[in-house]
């Protein structure tokens, strides 16, 4: 996250960190006790079974008692994910256990299925453990920045026509650099307490106003998300699972 600030620890309890070989790699967010949403491109060249998902974290390198760590039992990328264009850049991670909900671990609500994205100018927040500058500086803890929704046609023009309708864009609202950076991928764009966007890609420089930040528009995938979650719930399974609605 560039141009942002460190959040109050555990004030974004839905945040998940996906790590490989002990290093944070991508973000994600908890929507169900067994499921985290992340970006499909995070797993294009990584074996999901080698990854770990950490919930309840603030400073990832600190051994916080609130942290819950899971391996990835299954990673379900959207069947129409296109690495060449990053279209349909969304992935569901099934945890190998059930998250224990509490003050530091909570679910994030999804938008209504096929809901219109927030109007241009709407203030939203994106958070993550990604770099805080183009120098690839790691953050001291979970970071967040306020951004504004940008009209998709304006954004598509800035991106030389590369976007599709299931994407969402934000900008700083001024000329300053504010937005996400490398390793924020998969994290949520929260508008009105719902995950309307999922961090997908940005331009040459983090927060560059000329190439606005691009997100997967979550509302376009809500049906798919719950279809996957439902399909994986075995009829004979016991124990209560909770989902955000």
């Amino acid at each position: 996250i560039v141009g942002g600030h460190e959040v109050t620890p555990h004030s974004r309890p839905y945040m998940a960190s996906v790590s490989f070989e002990g290093h944070h790699y991508c973000g994600g967010f908890l929507i169900h006790t067994h499921w985290v949403v992340s970006a499909a491109h995070c797993f294009s060249d990584r074996d999901p079974s080698m990854g770990l998902v950490v919930l309840g974290a603030h400073a990832l390198l600190a051994p916080e008692p609130t942290q819950q760590t899971f391996s990835i039992a299954a990673a379900v990328s959207h069947p129409d994910f296109q690495p060449a264009t990053q279209a349909n850049d969304i992935c569901l991670l099934r945890l190998n256990g059930s998250a224990v909900l509490g003050p530091a671990v909570r679910l994030l609500r999804l938008p209504r299925r096929n809901a219109k994205p927030p109007a241009a100018g709407t203030r939203c927040h994106v958070s993550g453990w990604g770099f805080v500058s183009d120098f690839e500086e790691p953050p001291p803890g979970l970071m967040e920045v306020e951004v504004r929704i940008l009209d998709l046609s304006v954004c598509n023009s800035s991106w030389q026509g590369q976007l599709n309708p299931a994407m969402l864009c934000t900008h700083s609202g001024d000329r300053r650099r504010r937005g996400f950076c490398s390793a924020d991928s998969g994290g949520p764009l929260v508008c009105g307490r719902r995950a309307h966007g999922l961090v997908s890609f940005s331009g040459l420089w983090c927060g560059d106003p000329k190439t606005p930040d691009v997100y997967t528009q979550v509302s376009a995938f809500v049906t798919w998300i719950w279809d996957v979650v439902r399909a994986s719930s075995s009829p004979g399974s016991t124990g209560r699972s909770v989902r955000a609605v």
């Epitope: 060449a84 264009t85 990053q86 950076c181 490398s182 331009g203 983090c206």
Partner: antibody, heavy 119, light 107 residues
Framework: EVQLVESGGGLVQPGGSLRLSCAAS????????IHWVRQAPGKGLEWVAW????????YYADSVKGRFTISADTSKNTAYLQMNSLRAEDTAVYYC????????????WGQGTLVTVSS | DIQMTQSPSSLSASVGDRVTITCRAS??????VAWYQQKPGKAPKLLIY???FLYSGVPSRFSGSGSGTDFTLTISSLQPEDFATYYC?????????FGQGTKVEIK
Amino acid sequence: EVQLVESGGGLVQPGGSLRLSCAASGFTFSGSGIHWVRQAPGKGLEWVAWISPTGGNTYYADSVKGRFTISADTSKNTAYLQMNSLRAEDTAVYYCAKSLFHNVAFDYWGQGTLVTVSS
Amino acid sequence: DIQMTQSPSSLSASVGDRVTITCRASQDVSTAVAWYQQKPGKAPKLLIYSASFLYSGVPSRFSGSGSGTDFTLTISSLQPEDFATYYCQQSYTTPPTFGQGTKVEIK
């Protein structure tokens, strides 16, 4: 040792096409953005195009937009520049360059390949 | 696009001289400026990034300074191998743009 080696340059008539290649070694291709920068004879440097580390995103200079296409094959550690509808003003040495950090600067450059557009 | 204007376009200097090249951006680019050295028939080489950070392996006689719109590359004591053309480049906003170059020649 980091190396970038361009190939594919040559003489082409106006309106023709060429495909340049940039073979990378000594670094993780998928961890760094790749750029093409050109230099017309006796002139300065002009940035042409960029492809993101994932290969999923691209951006072009206005002067080549719609005519040039940058792509990458991460399995081959190679980037490409497909140049169509070539014009005389595209005559230049074309360099591929690797990003330092998150595109802060270009820290490694290839030796360049000359593209001449002439009838 | 942001214009980067270098001055002078060329200069003559002797070995041991202190040489200063300036670069002015058409708008604020913070400290997102790099400097390159290029010799005839060769690819550019990175000297300085983020206005003042010396790139690995570059001799300490090279230094950079500035922020906002005005930037400077200084060679504290010119060496025979330093005769070349120098370019500044902004990496603040898309597209990246270069200065027109400053040719440093032997007096």
